[in-house]
């Protein structure tokens, strides 16, 4: 009785269960009743990352420096090359096919999370008591100056973009 389903790591072909090729190898010829599945290793610039019956290996991803990409991890016969972006740039998508410059946080916003090769800068509004007066991809919101600790008084209130202005206390005569 020919099988209608096969075990894990097998596939059904012409009423016969054949072994899949292991990761890093491609299918050359299906099995027969007398011969095991024929598989061949992928060449140096290729890979297959699953148990498969592919007749062609996949090409390793090319990290194109013209798109700001660089190799984070070299591919093997079983894994694809992993690209990342050069310093100051990050990937535009999860597959990291191109890079764009990190965004800066505008005045009134501070850096919550510094950008990496794969993620952009995350900005947050400066809360009351904090400010940022620069456009930066690195600087967090800074706390307003504490006039009291300097034995001074607030002459001008701070905003999310400006620090407070301290001045001497008025001496009462």
């Amino acid at each position: 009785e020919p099988p209608t389903a096969c075990r894990e790591k097998q596939y059904l072909i012409n009423s016969q269960c054949c072994s899949l090729c292991q990761p890093g190898q491609k299918l050359v010829s299906d099995c027969t009743e007398f011969t095991e599945t024929e598989c061949l290793p992928c060449s140096e610039s290729e890979f297959l990352d699953t148990w498969n019956r592919e007749t062609r290996c996949h090409q390793h991803k090319y990290c194109d420096p013209n798109l700001g990409l660089q190799v984070q991890q070299k591919g093997t016969s079983e894994t694809d090359t992993i690209c990342t972006c050069e310093e100051g740039l990050h990937c535009t998508s999860e597959s990291c096919e191109s890079c764009v410059p990190h965004r800066s946080c505008l005045p009134g916003f501070g850096v919550k999370q510094i950008a990496t090769g794969v993620s952009d800068t995350i900005c947050e509004p400066c809360p009351v008591g904090f400010f940022s007066n620069v456009s930066s991809a690195f600087e967090k919101c800074r706390p307003w100056t504490s006039c009291e600790t300097k034995d001074l008084v607030v002459q001008q209130a701070g905003t999310n973009k400006t620090d407070v202005v301290c001045g001497p206390q008025d001496r009462q005569r």
């Epitope: 012409n14 010829s29 299906d30 099995c31 027969t32 009743e33 007398f34 011969t35 095991e36 024929e38």
Partner: antibody, heavy 117, light 109 residues
Framework: QVQLVESGGGVVQPGRSLRLSCAAS????????MHWVRQAPGKGLEWVAV????????YYADSVKGRFTISRDNSKNTLYLQMNSLRAEDTAVYYC??????????WGQGTMVTVSS | EIVLTQSPGTLSLSPGERATLSCRAS???????LAWYQQKPGQAPRLLIY???SRANGIPDRFSGSGSGTDFTLTISRLEPEDFAVYYC??????????FGGGTKVEIK
């Protein structure tokens, strides 16, 4: 390169025995089924026997059943055909061939067996 | 047991001509597992076509196979001097036994 080389042929009297060998090289012998195919002088091809990669399954043509035995030694990359009770009609060139889902893709050069008194 | 009948028995043609060889099976060949082999005098057979229509490695594209079920054809589009030989069809799905056709001899006219 992938190669099959037969040996052991010769002239033998009817009723006697002969053992043919087929030495394989250039591929993973233990993964492939193997066949013996013969060709009588001036005639066509006749399939004789097949053995599975691990040696468990064996099939024979009716004309040789009970007289011929196919076997293999994977540690020596060698296929055998033990031929007993030979008859004049067994006179032929004997080829070994590799089994694949593409048919018999690699053949040896053949070895001549002549059964004559 | 499947019986394969090849025709014609002999084909007399000149180099550059087209050769059409037929192989008829007594019953349908499973999965089109039909192969064609070429054999020259004093040599072992060589696999040309498998799966009825796929060329084996290194086989020139002037050789082509077609057909399914019970009727199969090997075509040599333009005969080269080295193509004059005997051609066999073979069913390698429905075993035992594996069967070969009687052969077609392609000779120089």
């Amino acid at each position: 390169q992938v190669q099959l080389v037969e040996s052991g042929g010769g002239v033998v009297q009817p009723g006697r025995s002969l053992r043919l060998s087929c030495a394989a090289s250039g591929f993973t012998f233990e993964k492939y089924g193997m066949h013996w195919v013969r060709q009588a002088p001036g005639k066509g091809l006749e399939w004789v026997a097949v053995i599975s990669y691990e040696g468990e399954k064996k099939y024979y043509a009716d004309s040789v059943k009970g007289r011929f035995t196919i076997s293999r030694d994977n540690s020596k990359n060698t296929l055998y055909l033990q031929m007993n009770s030979l008859r004049a009609e067994d006179t032929a060139v004997y080829y070994c061939a590799r089994d694949t889902s593409r048919g018999h893709d690699i053949w040896g050069q053949g070895t001549m067996v002549t059964v004559s008194s | 047991e499947i019986v394969l009948t090849q025709s014609p028995g002999t084909l007399s043609l000149s180099p550059g001509e087209r050769a059409t060889l037929s192989c008829r099976a007594s019953q349908s060949v499973s999965y089109s597992y039909l192969a064609w082999y070429q054999q020259k005098p004093g040599q072992a057979p060589r696999l040309l076509i498998y799966g009825a229509s796929s060329r084996a490695n290194g086989i020139p594209d002037r050789f082509s196979g077609s057909g399914s079920g019970t009727d199969f054809t090997l075509t040599i589009s333009r005969l080269e001097p080295e193509d004059f030989a005997v051609y066999y069809c073979s069913d390698y799905a429905d075993y035992p036994p594996f069967t070969f056709g009687g052969g077609t001899k392609v000779e120089i006219k």
